[in-house]
Amino acid sequence: APRGTQAEESPFVGNPGNITGARGLTGTLRCQLQVQGEPPEVHWLRDGQILELADSTQTQVPLGEDEQDDWIVVSQLRITSLQLSDTGQYQCLVFLGHQTFVSQPGYVGLEGLPYFLEEPEDRTVAANTPFNLSCQAQGPPEPVDLLWLQDAVPLATAPGHGPQRSLHVPGLNKTSSFSCEAHNAKGVTTSRTATITVLPQQPRNLHLVSRQPTELEVAWTPGLSGIYPLTHCTLQAVLSDDGMGIQAGEPDPPEEPLTSQASVPPHQLRLGSLHPHTPYHIRVACTSSQGPSSWTHWLPVETPEGVPLGPPENISATRNGSQAFVHWQEPRAPLQGTLLGYRLAYQGQDTPEVLMDIGLRQEVTLELQGDGSVSNLTVCVAAYTAAGDGPWSLPVPLEAWRPGEAQPVHQLVKEPSTPAFSWPWW
């Protein structure tokens, strides 16, 4: 065990010096003591607290050949990359016997150019829209005075006279750069330069202009875009799904949207190739040379019903005396809406046309007038939706039914563009 020394005499012959420097500086504190007998371990204190993980080295040199002779002990504390947390009062401490000895203090101070805790960040903003930027710097030495610059031009007449930590920008009409200077007694530090990119404002008032079964015409009001003209607008349409729940601001639909680009002006677009009688959600964003605006909220729209695109299929018409049996199948062509029923017309060579609404049935028995001797009797059938009638089938001749024969099936159709009849009373 180390032999004690008298209480009145400190073993320290060299005390820690002072270090004052800028952040990142590397320095060494040193203390030296002379003791008799086995050298003690030297501990380092900062502001009275033992440094458990100190980067210290201890060198011991005997002054004689006997173990009980005096020793010179040197302890060096290395401070690498000086930080604010390293500052304070440093002392060496040793335990000799039952006594504790502490060296005279040395001081570590931080003093240099301002150090940025926060710097302005790059960002995008909509034209003429207010935003804030942040900058924060510290010493020591304090105080630190800030000066904001926009496109390298000071925004105040002198440091400390304008906004300090937070800069409120009421709006920009062109892409600009911002930085801040931090001034203290040691000099000036300049922050990174933030680029604030001015994008077009979100378009407004997205609305339907006209609707057709497979086509929607939409229009919108463009937002301001600063000094940068809009180059185009992009419209997206997505099939609505009740389970999908596209809310007003929901960012992305679950399936791939139908995307169309519109040259601007005009701020209008015809969206084609849509499904009839189908709910969609649409949104629009506009783009300048600086980039795209944010999307509008999703707008729910719906294509209207259309008329069926084809006539009923596989029409058969047979006659048995004064009765005729007619049946058919649903059109293969798209209905473009909800099928509400079928209309049937029949006519003889010299008799007026008879019109009937069959409803949703796909067969009908006709009671023919007279003895059924009317010649060249023909039947036409058309499907209809709420939007109106689809094309009529080509006239199907009523054929006499012979027991044991299959019923004739007629698949000939009229051209859809040629309406067979008009129904002013329907």
Epitope: A156, T157, A158, P159, H161, A185, G187
Partner: antibody, heavy 113, light 107 residues
């Protein structure tokens, strides 16, 4: 600690040039802006102008044709020159950092023949 | 130039009184306003910066308020050491301009 000290003649003849120097200690003049303010006896404060850390200047237009502020960074000093002085230029002249945390104690300059 | 009109030019008050000094700019100066205290034979001392921010070491009985072109310095409870002349300064635009001063005297 930061100290500013004005120096220069206390008496200047009319039509001559008033020259004052401000010596700064504890703060580098290559940081911040440094200015001159004056106060005629019994009157209010008047801003004369400043020099920036980079050496550019800004002056009160009412004095602009007669005033010049310069600096010597090696001595950490900045100076004021005011030409063609008249009795109306009699005042206590203060140098200060433009944040106005630190001022010189002021020096009285009298313009008289 | 921006003109700064300070009022009153002088006032008499007693220790403990609440004192209000106003400064009106000839145009909007956006809070680029400072208040100074000056005692005879001394350099001015910064009291308030940015219209409302108390300078280091200034007692909390001092406060600043205002916006646009109208600003106020308030001393909530006047102390003996507060008897002095007070100046406002706008630094929104060059040239910087001071108010003509308000002398606070003992009643």
């Amino acid at each position: 600690q930061v100290q500013l000290q004005e120096s220069g003649p206390g008496l200047v003849k009319p039509s001559e040039t008033l020259s004052l120097t401000c010596t700064v200690s504890g703060y580098s003049i290559t940081s911040n802006y440094w200015g001159w303010i004056r106060q005629p006896p019994g009157k209010g404060l008047e801003w004369i102008g400043y020099i920036t850390y980079s050496g550019s200047t800004s002056y009160n237009p009412s004095l602009k044709s007669r005033v010049s502020i310069s600096r010597d960074t090696s001595k950490n000093q900045f100076s004021l020159k005011l030409s063609s002085v008249t009795a109306a230029d009699t005042a206590v002249y203060y140098c200060a950092i433009t944040t106005f945390y630190y001022w010189g104690q002021g020096t009285l300059v009298t313009v008289s023949s | 130039d921006i003109q700064m009109t300070q009022s009153p030019s002088s006032l008499s008050a007693s220790v403990g009184d609440r004192v209000t000094i106003t400064c009106r700019a000839s145009q909007d100066i956006g809070n680029y306003l400072r208040w100074y205290q000056q005692k005879p034979g001394k350099a001015p001392k910064l009291m308030i910066s940015g219209a409302t921010n108390l300078a280091a070491g200034v007692p909390s009985r001092f406060s600043g308020s205002g916006s646009g072109s109208d600003y106020t310095l308030t001393i909530s409870s006047l102390q003996p050491e507060d008897f002095a002349t007070y100046y406002c300064l706008q630094s929104k635009e060059s040239p910087w301009t001071f108010g003509q001063g308000t002398k606070v005297e003992i009643k």
